[in-house]
């Protein structure tokens, strides 16, 4: 599967829509800013082995989708843009799932994958707890939108890992 190419294209499109979703100037929400400790930004790219890159990206995409398809999310964003963003994520998820099914049996994913997956889940847990703490305020959602934009932007750094599979 030609994942690096398709993932990059879909990711660019999703990021563009996510940027358009902004409703508040970021500067007006400075007091609500939070570091959620995005795990794939703080780890060395070489740690993510090619066999674990797809499951990690899938989990990142799935958790993002869960976040933006929640009831609280639909009240926070423009419905048309939100639909478009979630559709892009759905397509990404399908691509990742297809590649993952092709990968199964080819190589046993390393145990280190468990660490990366748990780290991603903890990251999204911090985000959902933060939104709850802030009572899903418009500023809290803006902080989360900006955070997810950063996370999805960083996720393309895993693409070199995927390209290596074809070599």
């Amino acid at each position: 599967c030609d994942l690096p190419h398709t993932y990059n294209l879909r990711n660019k499109r999703a990021l563009k829509v996510l940027a358009q979703m902004r409703r508040l100037p970021f500067l007006s929400c400075l007091k609500d800013r939070q570091d959620f400790g995005f795990p794939l930004e703080k780890v060395d790219n070489q740690q993510i082995q090619k066999a674990q890159a797809i499951p990690v990206l899938r989990d990142l995409t799935q958790q993002t989708l869960n976040l933006f398809t929640s009831k609280a999310s639909s009240a926070a964003w423009n419905a048309t843009l939100l639909d478009s963003f979630c559709n892009d994520l759905h397509q990404q998820l399908n691509d990742l799932q297809t590649c993952l099914m092709q990968q199964v049996g080819v190589q046993e994913p390393p145990l280190t994958q468990e660490d990366a997956l748990l780290a991603v889940r903890k990251y999204f847990h911090r985000i959902t707890v933060y939104l709850r703490e802030k009572k899903h305020s418009p500023c809290a959602w803006e902080v989360v939108r900006a955070e997810v934009w950063r996370a999805l932007s960083s996720s393309v750094n895993l693409l070199p890992r995927l390209s290596e599979e074809k070599e």
Partner: antibody, heavy 122, light 107 residues
């Protein structure tokens, strides 16, 4: 009894390298993230690095990133830190520490070794 | 990085006194704030995790409270063996950061 035993400390010249080891016993080593925390003599605590239970999800303090490398061998219940390009500011007691969860973040450091002293000096 | 500010840096109190140590973080860490005790010449020991959870074997005179950015460690009735340094630490995200420490002395 749960125990962590550090070794490998000693005197090293600035710019030199050192590898610290920590042998764990009394608990299921492969189920928990592990960290290194250091303390300069007479000073406070500084977290250095953490590694996930399966050897993935490695995190480093900004002061050591690019110089230190944390790793583990679950078959031998051993934690390591390879320290390169050491400077006088790295002089400290280095503690091997067990975390309460499988990967770092949203947890605590619930078991500490006695520490090994690293002195960087000419 | 999350800054952790602990106060006071030292205190002197009598046996039986109630003692409180404060810890503030530069952003919300929810409940992920831990307290450690370090006796002279020893490695630190976890006293309280997740702001208020007392660790097994730790005397009940120790208690922790707070959430978000403001936390307090309280020793209800100070004992001679409580003479030590106390550190708070945010375990919310890496890099983990510690407070500067509070040295507790017995008068």
């Amino acid at each position: 009894e749960m125990q962590l035993m550090e070794s490998g400390g000693g005197l090293v010249q600035p710019g030199g390298s050192l590898r610290l080891s920590c042998v764990a016993s009394g608990f299921t080593f492969k189920s928990f993230a592990m960290s290194w925390v250091r303390q300069a003599p007479g000073k406070g605590l500084e977290w250095v690095a953490s590694v996930g239970s399966q050897g993935g999800s490695k995190y480093y303090a900004p002061s050591v990133k690019g110089r230190f490398s944390i790793s583990r061998d679950n078959s031998n219940n051993t934690l390591y830190v390879q320290m390169n390009s050491l400077g006088v500011e790295d002089t400290a007691f280095y503690y091997c520490v067990k975390e309460t969860d499988a990967v770092a973040t949203m947890d605590a450091l619930d078991m500490w070794g006695q520490g090994t002293l690293v002195i960087v000096s000419t | 990085d999350i800054r952790v500010t602990q106060s006071p840096s030292s205190l002197s109190a009598s046996v039986g006194d109630r003692v409180s140590i404060s810890c503030q973080t530069s952003q919300s860490v929810n409940i992920y704030l831990n307290w450690y005790q370090q006796r002279p010449g020893k490695g630190p020991q976890l006293l309280i995790s997740a702001a208020s959870t007392l660790q097994s074997g730790v005397p009940s005179r120790f208690s922790g409270s707070g959430s978000g950015t403001d936390f307090i460690l309280t020793i209800i009735s100070l004992q001679p063996e409580d003479s030590a340094s106390y550190y708070c630490q945010q375990g919310y995200i890496t890099p983990y950061t510690f407070g500067q420490g509070t040295k507790v002395e017995i008068k």
